[in-house]
């Protein structure tokens, strides 16, 4: 049980990993906070991400998900997730379609579909995890001022 009066530290129990994704596919990043009810912000190049046609944001208790839909070359780069004073950076690398599947001749039609209709694409390749940046971020916040600033 925490000491009364002490402010809890918002930290990640699971950090998003950098991924390589084929152009046109979605990229899904997952983070888990140690407690529920914690505000999480996702960033691209230091700017906060809002839910849109391009980005899907979801929370279920401690689980937080960012989906980048139909990734293209413009989506490649550095991303971050912030909870309180904890910030974790990760990267998205986009593989162009012709680089992903080089073909000399048209492939014959498959005899059977490899995935059920509506099935999620295969998981993207993981590139590993980047280290958290120094605590505290000076960027503008969607859910608050400088992350981790006491507000009670």
């Amino acid at each position: 049980m925490p000491e009364p009066g002490k402010k809890p530290v918002s930290a990640f129990s699971k950090k998003p990993r950098s991924v390589e994704v084929a152009a046109g596919s979605p990229a899904v990043f997952e983070a888990e906070t140690e407690r529920a009810g914690v505000k999480v912000r996702w960033q691209r190049g230091g700017s906060d991400i809002s839910a849109s046609n391009k980005y899907g944001l979801a929370t279920e208790g401690t689980r937080h998900t960012l989906t980048v839909r139909e990734v293209g070359p413009a989506d490649q780069g550095s991303y971050a997730v912030i909870a309180g004073s904890s910030k974790v950076k990760f990267d998205l690398k986009v593989i162009e379609a012709e680089k992903a599947e080089p073909m000399l001749a048209p492939a014959p039609a498959p005899a059977e579909a490899t995935g059920a209709p509506g099935e999620a694409p295969a998981p993207a390749a993981e590139l590993g995890e980047s280290a958290p940046s120094p605590k505290g971020s000076s960027s503008a916040a969607l859910n608050g001022p400088t992350p981790g600033a006491p507000d009670d």
Epitope: R35, K39, G148
Partner: antibody
Amino acid sequence: QEQLEESGGGLVKPGGTLTLTCKVSGFDFSSGYDMCWVRQAPGKGLESIACIGSSSASTWYANWVNGRFTVSRSTSLNTVDLKMTSLTVADTATYFCARESSTEYYYNLWGPGTLVTVSS
Amino acid sequence: DIVMTQTPASVEAAVGGTVTIKCQASQSIGNALAWYQQKPGQPPKLLIYSTSYLPSGVPSRFKGGGSGAEYTLTISDLECADAATYYCQSYYVSTSSSDRSSFGGGTEVVVK
């Protein structure tokens, strides 16, 4: 001193429309706090209504709202509005403006409230 | 929607005594629970957040505990100023079910 102050309450007929305004002072409104509205019927408990993110891009409404209420905010005016339409007698309550914590979803600052009475 | 059931609806205790208020959630809310104190004609005041943390200025006589779906608020060494209505709030967030904030029905504390 950090303060919230609601205005715009009063008597309105069933089916009517009313807009409540919350004036923010004493803290940097543009720095990112989510702002919410909570109501309390006479002699009853608290009921969350809606919240809006700092950029106005994200909004949340309680499921029971069913599109009748709209929350908005103006960074230049330091205000948060709640537009209420198709009001019924059941909407009679004191309406509070509340600020969420920057790091979690609880409310750490409240306004004194404004009374809305829906009656013919 | 998450439903918060608070018991008892009312409790009476003497100055210097102890009261315990319970809050039961309809599902596990992972410690995303706050308690508020409200006096007549006033807005609620934050007492406890994240189940057991006290904001600065709140006396340590107020203690929160619990986990999963069951939570408690204990007020010890009761003072006349503690006479108020107390509310629990779940702030477990679920995008899929649109959960963000649910209050219990409140508990009136009467101090003799």
